[in-house]
């Protein structure tokens, strides 16, 4: 058993049918010695008397808020949560497996640049009685500080007969050095509590591996005289690291017809302009990627040919 926060304790339970459970001793936080009784949640049933209460925690029915009283007065509370292990594996019931980029991916993180700021998000089908707490550091044995805000509900989606909730959190490395080679990964730890269930989720990554630039900005077309060709120009996104001579991007320019089946013409360039043939009813799209490290491409920025 360990303390999650004041008066909230997590019992680690290795569960299987007929498991003996964990013996837990609760102590009433009071100088009183006599006439103390214990109850669980809203029930008035007296579970025991005395300054300590010994319970065998076998299942979620044994978790909850234990209260010690004397003469009708509440003396103290202890909330017991369960962290359940089955077949040697800690439960992952609260969050949804996003299966990207691989199975058992519960947390996904992205950074728009090398400033040490990143966003992580996760999915759940649970709508109520849910709290998250996020901690992060660079490295784990001698951790360097990363500050995370509060997790917030960032999107709701309906998928079939299921409602899905997306939560996200923003974190910032306290002493980030954008140009430095990373040797220790960022560690992100999310504590999730649903009702009486505690779970924790972790992710470990280098900023360079989670980079996803914003789309190029100010995408413009300039028709070339006496030609079906156009000059496409764009700029680096505002959120990308500077100077651009050091933090360089490469770009992919795509001409896509109205029909998805039509052949796509693609041009790759390190410049911020390109000359392409603009077909009728087609659109031109540009996306960006770090020039020197193959992390994610940005989303597309698009303009119609007409």
């Amino acid at each position: 058993i360990w303390e999650l926060k004041k008066d909230v304790y997590v019992v680690e339970l290795d569960w299987y049918p007929d498991a003996p459970g964990e013996m837990v001793v609760l102590t009433c936080d009071t100088p009183e010695e006599d006439g103390i009784t214990w109850t669980l949640d809203q029930s008035s049933e007296v579970l025991g008397s005395g300054k300590t209460l010994t319970i065998q925690v076998k299942e979620f029915g044994d978790a909850g808020q234990y209260t010690c009283h004397k003469g009708g007065e509440v003396l103290s509370h202890s909330l017991l949560l369960l962290h359940k292990k089955e077949d040697g594996i800690w439960s992952t019931d609260i969050l949804k497996d996003q299966k990207e980029p691989k199975n058992k991916t519960f947390l996904r993180c992205e950074a728009k640049n090398y400033s040490g700021r990143f966003t992580c998000w996760w999915l759940t089908t649970i709508s109520t009685d849910l709290t998250f707490s996020v901690k992060s550091s660079r490295g784990s044995s001698d951790p360097q500080g990363v500050t995370c805000g509060a997790a917030t509900l960032s999107a709701e989606r309906v998928r079939g007969d299921n409602k899905e909730y997306e939560y996200s959190v923003e974190c910032q490395e306290d002493s980030a050095c954008p140009a430095a080679e990373e040797s220790l990964p960022i560690e992100v730890m999310v504590d999730a509590v649903h009702k009486l269930k505690y779970e924790n989720y972790t992710s470990s990554f280098f900023i360079r591996d989670i980079i996803k630039p914003d789309p190029p900005k100010n995408l413009q077309l300039k028709p070339l005289k006496n030609s079906r060709q156009v000059e496409v120009s764009w700029e680096y996104p505002d959120t990308w690291s500077t100077p651009h001579s050091y933090f360089s991007l490469t770009f992919c320019v795509q001409v896509q017809g109205k029909s998805k089946r039509e052949k796509k013409d693609r041009v790759f360039t390190d410049k911020t302009s390109a000359t392409v043939i603009c077909r009728k009813n087609a659109s031109i799209s540009v996306r960006a990627q770090d020039r020197y490290y193959s992390s994610s491409w940005s989303e597309w920025a698009s303009v119609p040919c007409s």
């Epitope: 569960w15 049918p17 949640d41 809203q42 299942e59 979620f60 029915g61 909850g64 089955e86 019931d93 089908t125 649970i126 079939g160 007969d161 299921n162 409602k163 649903h194 009702k195 009486l196 269930k197």
Partner: nanobody, 123 residues
């Protein structure tokens, strides 16, 4: 919202078998742990059995262990309770419930409840 409808109850002789079903609708069935409870006249509601969302783990009350088996079919949105070697003391209204805390024998940990199906076992 989740709607639960039990079926399969009836009047039977001691020693025979009965299979109860619980049909769920409303929200994704496979997101929920499920349980069976029973209530005999003049007695408190009693936990019978529970099953986790995938059906890989079950939790059965000591009073029915070895005689009752809980199972589920997520493709059909149904849960079943196979009751063998029934005894007169199994007479009760059997109610199914959904929750998100498996394993639990506590009513307070279940969120949605059916109306129940009557099982009467005569000697």
């Amino acid at each position: 919202e989740v709607q639960l409808v039990e079926s399969g109850g009836g009047l039977v002789q001691a020693g025979v078998s009965l299979r109860l079903s619980c049909a769920a609708s409303g929200r994704a069935f496979s997101n929920f742990d499920m349980g069976w409870f029973r209530q005999a006249p003049g007695r408190e509601r009693e936990f019978v059995a529970a099953i986790n969302r995938s059906g890989s783990s079950t939790y059965v009350s000591a009073s029915v262990k070895g005689r009752f088996t809980i199972s589920r079919d997520n493709a059909k949105n149904t849960m079943s309770l196979q009751m063998n070697n029934l005894k007169p003391e199994d007479t009760a209204v059997y109610v199914c419930a959904t929750g998100l805390l498996f394993p639990s024998s506590a009513e307070r940990n279940y969120d949605y409840w059916g109306q129940g199906t009557q099982v009467t076992v005569s000697s």
